[in-house]
């Protein structure tokens, strides 16, 4: 049913990191355009990427004015030349996304190992807080301003002449480790949220080693 | 605890008119579309209208459009059913429903029943 | 408007019995439907929504399966506090109900 050659839109899927959030459906048009539509639970509908030939439209500009809402989004279908045209039940063809709920959901993009830093026994591992595109006040929150203590980080590290790894947790952007005097230490970090139930672990950051070029002190 | 209180309803003569209102509480009202639903003695359920949960979006099923009005006052968590020109087919029981995105309904109030006849 | 048919409109069933009622779709609603129990007197209650998703506190003997144009309500062993009226609601084009299918004690 629906409009005449017009296909409604499938696949329906949020794709987000760190609160960049698009959404993306099939299939590619053949003589027809989309208009995407977007609402938290009030039923608010907002729309967005009008009669686009597009199979995405980015919503990071909605949903990032609450990232604890829980978002719907809906993909209409028009015939090309004719977005007037309405389907069997006097509306146009759509389809529905999944619920999308952004502080639950986005992932945690890979993190940056920011600096480290010796002295004596111990080393110090910043993680990069990333800028994310959340605004409060007119300016964008990190990634720690969103989540807070809810987000903590795992460090990995081992000595560079073996293999067998340590772990240490932080709920801030820095780690304090013991380490033997003398021997070069690897790292890599990794974003986690405990509370979650889905995407609750980033991709391991970039492995850093000391006494390479990078060097221990880094901005 | 989620709530919805229904009143208003009374009996009326048919071409008179009756406001319905549904006090909301135990939630942030304005976060959710809001409805109505009726069911005719011994009948179904049929849905009357819809609000979203600014008050921009209005919907109505085509057997009360015109003479139907829904509203909302989020500063006084109150849904309302403005009901005019009423008919002895209108005599049902209305509810009252949080709906989120206008879709379906999750919580519904007891209900209030509104009799038209002379 | 899209019609929304239930069937059986009365099921006799007993306690523990597996219970499966229908509805159909006069068209396509993907999997936008949900499901309500009413008992007389009462407001209706939410049980499923988008055909599958049980809510939150219903028992988990209450499922809900289909897409397209078929849907079913499923109670997997009948309990004396389910005998009740069940609706079907599609919510894919405006909103619309099923007649409704009375289980009643056999």
């Known amino acids: 049913s629906g409009t005449t050659n017009t296909v409604a839109a499938y696949n329906l899927t949020w794709k987000s990191t760190n609160f960049k959030t698009i959404l993306e459906w099939e299939p590619k048009p053949v003589n027809q355009v989309y208009t995407v539509q977007i609402s938290t639970k009030s039923g608010d509908w907002k729309s967005k990427c009008f009669y686009t030939t597009d199979t995405e439209c980015d919503l990071t500009d909605e949903i990032v004015k609450d990232v604890n809402q829980t978002y719907l989004a809906r993909v209409f279908s028009y015939p090309a030349g004719n977005v007037e045209s309405t389907g069997s039940a006097g509306e146009p063809l759509y389809e529905n996304s999944p619920e999308f709920t952004p502080y639950l959901e986005t992932n945690l993009g890979q993190p940056t190992i920011q600096s480290f830093e010796q002295v004596g026994t111990k080393v110090n591992v910043t993680v990069e807080d990333e800028r994310t595109l959340v605004r409060r006040n007119n300016t964008f929150l990190s990634l720690r301003d969103v989540f807070g203590k809810d987000l903590i980080y795992t460090l990995y590290y081992w000595k560079s002449s073996s293999s067998g790894k340590k772990t240490a947790k932080t709920n801030t952007n820095e780690f304090l480790i013991d380490v033997d005097k003398g021997e070069n230490y690897c790292f890599s970090v990794q974003a986690v949220i405990p509370s979650r139930t889905v995407n609750r672990k980033s991709t391991d950051s970039p492995v850093e080693c000391m006494g390479q070029e990078k060097g221990e002190f880094r901005e | 605890e989620v709530q919805l209180l229904e009143s208003g309803g009374g009996l009326v003569q048919p071409g008179g008119s009756l406001r319905l209102s549904c006090a909301a509480s135990?939630?942030?009202?304005?976060?959710?579309?809001m409805g109505w639903v009726r069911q005719a003695p011994g009948k179904g359920l049929e849905w009357v209208s819809t609000i979203s949960g600014s008050g921009g979006l209005t919907y109505y099923a085509d057997s009360v459009k015109g003479r139907f009005t829904i509203s909302r006052d989020n500063s006084k968590n109150t849904l309302y059913l403005q009901m005019n020109s009423l008919r002895a087919e209108d005599t049902a029981v209305y509810y009252c429903?949080?709906?989120?995105?206008?879709?379906?309904?999750?919580?519904w109030g007891k209900g209030t029943t509104v009799t038209v006849s002379s | 408007d899209i019609q929304m048919t239930q069937s059986p409109s009365t099921l006799s069933a007993s306690v523990g019995d597996r219970v499966t009622i229908t509805c159909r779709a006069s068209q396509s609603i993907s999997s936008w439907l949900a499901w309500y129990q009413q008992k007389p007197g009462k407001a209706p209650k939410l049980l499923i929504y988008?055909?599958?998703s049980l809510e939150s506190g219903v028992p988990s003997r209450f499922s809900g399966s289909g897409s397209g144009t078929e849907f079913t309500l499923t109670i997997s062993s009948l309990q004396p506090d389910d005998f009740a009226t069940y609706y079907c609601q599609q919510y894919k084009s405006y909103i619309t109900f099923g007649g409704g299918t009375k289980v009643e004690i056999k």
């Open positions: 429903a949080k709906a989120p995105y206008g879709y379906y309904m999750d919580v």
């Open positions: 135990g939630f942030t009202f304005s976060d959710y579309a």
């Open positions: 988008k055909a599958s």
